[in-house]
């Protein structure tokens, strides 16, 4: 499998979790592999077992502490290794110096709720989860609304270029079922990426008021 493609990608959720994916074409599905984390200025080491998520990729989460504890800072470097068992020994497959705040992916926003709904508009709020206080207000959001007869991929993206944990959706159709999702991204980090999309929030606009002559 030396000639096959391989990739070792990890992201820090800004608090106490580093999630990693290891992919390797041609690797045996039952190969036992793990990720080992060795910080440069912390007393802890951490290991997680890579579990298959598809034919040629494995994933695991390095749990560094309580979910809201701040386990790493912008100056930390964590050396990450992929080790796979070959017979009686572990072989290093991949290695990298991981800079957590250059490789951020936050948890999906949570607690989505309808604050107020009318015939043509809906006000929705949400919360961010396990996000570092280091960001202060330096976050952005993307949101999308699923209309009847469309797919999520067709939904236009609404961009919020500031830390705004609410949105007022306008120009909606009365008495119509919609779904709404939001995701978050810190402004910091060369390889930072969007969080997963939140769980969809379903809501229905109010029916139009009946006219006097109907």
């Amino acid at each position: 499998a030396v000639n096959g493609t391989s990739q070792f990608t990890c992201f820090y959720n800004s608090r106490a979790n580093i999630s990693c994916v290891w992919s390797q074409d041609g690797a045996l599905q039952d190969t036992s592999c793990q990720v080992h984390a060795w910080p440069d200025r912390r007393r802890w080491n951490q290991t997680c077992e890579l579990l298959p998520v598809s034919q040629a990729s494995w994933a695991c989460n390095l749990i560094l502490g309580a979910p809201d504890s701040q386990k790493l800072t912008t100056v930390d470097i964590v050396t990450l290794r992929v080790l796979c068992r070959e017979g009686v020994r572990w072989r290093v497959m991949a290695i990298q110096d991981f800079k957590p705040f250059e490789n951020l992916r936050l948890m999906a926003p949570i607690s989505l709720q309808v604050v107020h709904v009318e015939t043509h508009r809906c006000n929705i709020s949400w919360e961010i989860s396990q996000a570092s206080h280091y960001f202060e207000r330096h976050l952005e959001f993307e949101a999308r609304t699923l209309s009847p007869g469309h797919t999520w991929e067709e939904a236009p993206l609404l961009t919020l270029k500031q830390k705004q944990e609410w949105i007022c959706l306008e120009t909606l159709t009365p008495d119509t079922q919609y779904e709404f999702q939001v995701r978050v991204k810190p402004l910091q980090g060369e390889f930072t990426t969007w969080s997963p999309w939140s769980q969809p929030l379903a809501f229905r606009t109010k029916p139009a008021a009946l006219g006097k002559d109907t």
């Epitope: 391989s6 070792f8 990298q96």
Partner: nanobody, 126 residues
Framework: QVQLQESGGGSVQAGGSLRLSCVTS????????MAWFRQAPGKEREGVAI????????TYADSVKGRFTISRDNAANTLYLQMNSLKPEDTAMYYC???????????????????WGQGTQVTVSS
């Protein structure tokens, strides 16, 4: 443009030592994983050793463990390979290679690296 230039190769008797150098320019050396590969006549290129950007972590092929040492000087943009107790089977062309972030995969796979030097010949006679 990106350049990696190896030097320090030569001919040596078995049991002898050599120190290879690789001077780099044209990219952010201090953020790259750096590795040494070698290719003997008629054989595939193989990974010899890798070092992370900070220099705090290294990995070696089984065939050179305990004999070769990889190191780097980020201020001088230079990678080194100290080769001791050389054997005739170490005879090969030696190449340095760089994997810049976002990092790729198997450290000993050629396709992981995006920049390569031209190589320096090492010949070990018995």
């Amino acid at each position: 443009q990106v350049q990696l230039q190896e030097s320090g190769g030569g001919s040596v008797q078995a049991g002898g030592s050599l120190r290879l150098s690789c001077v780099t320019s044209g990219y952010t050396y201090s953020s790259a994983n750096m590795a040494w590969f070698r290719q003997a006549p008629g054989k595939e290129r193989e990974g010899v050793a890798i070092i992370t950007p900070s220099g705090r972590a290294t990995t070696y092929a089984d065939s050179v463990k305990g004999r070769f040492t990889i190191s780097r000087d980020n201020a001088a943009n230079t990678l080194y390979l100290q080769m001791n107790s050389l054997k005739p089977e170490d005879t090969a062309m030696y190449y340095c290679a760089a994997d810049t972030p976002p990092y790729s995969g198997l450290w000993y796979a050629e396709r992981t690296y995006n920049y390569w030097g031209q190589g320096t010949q090492v010949t070990v006679s018995s």
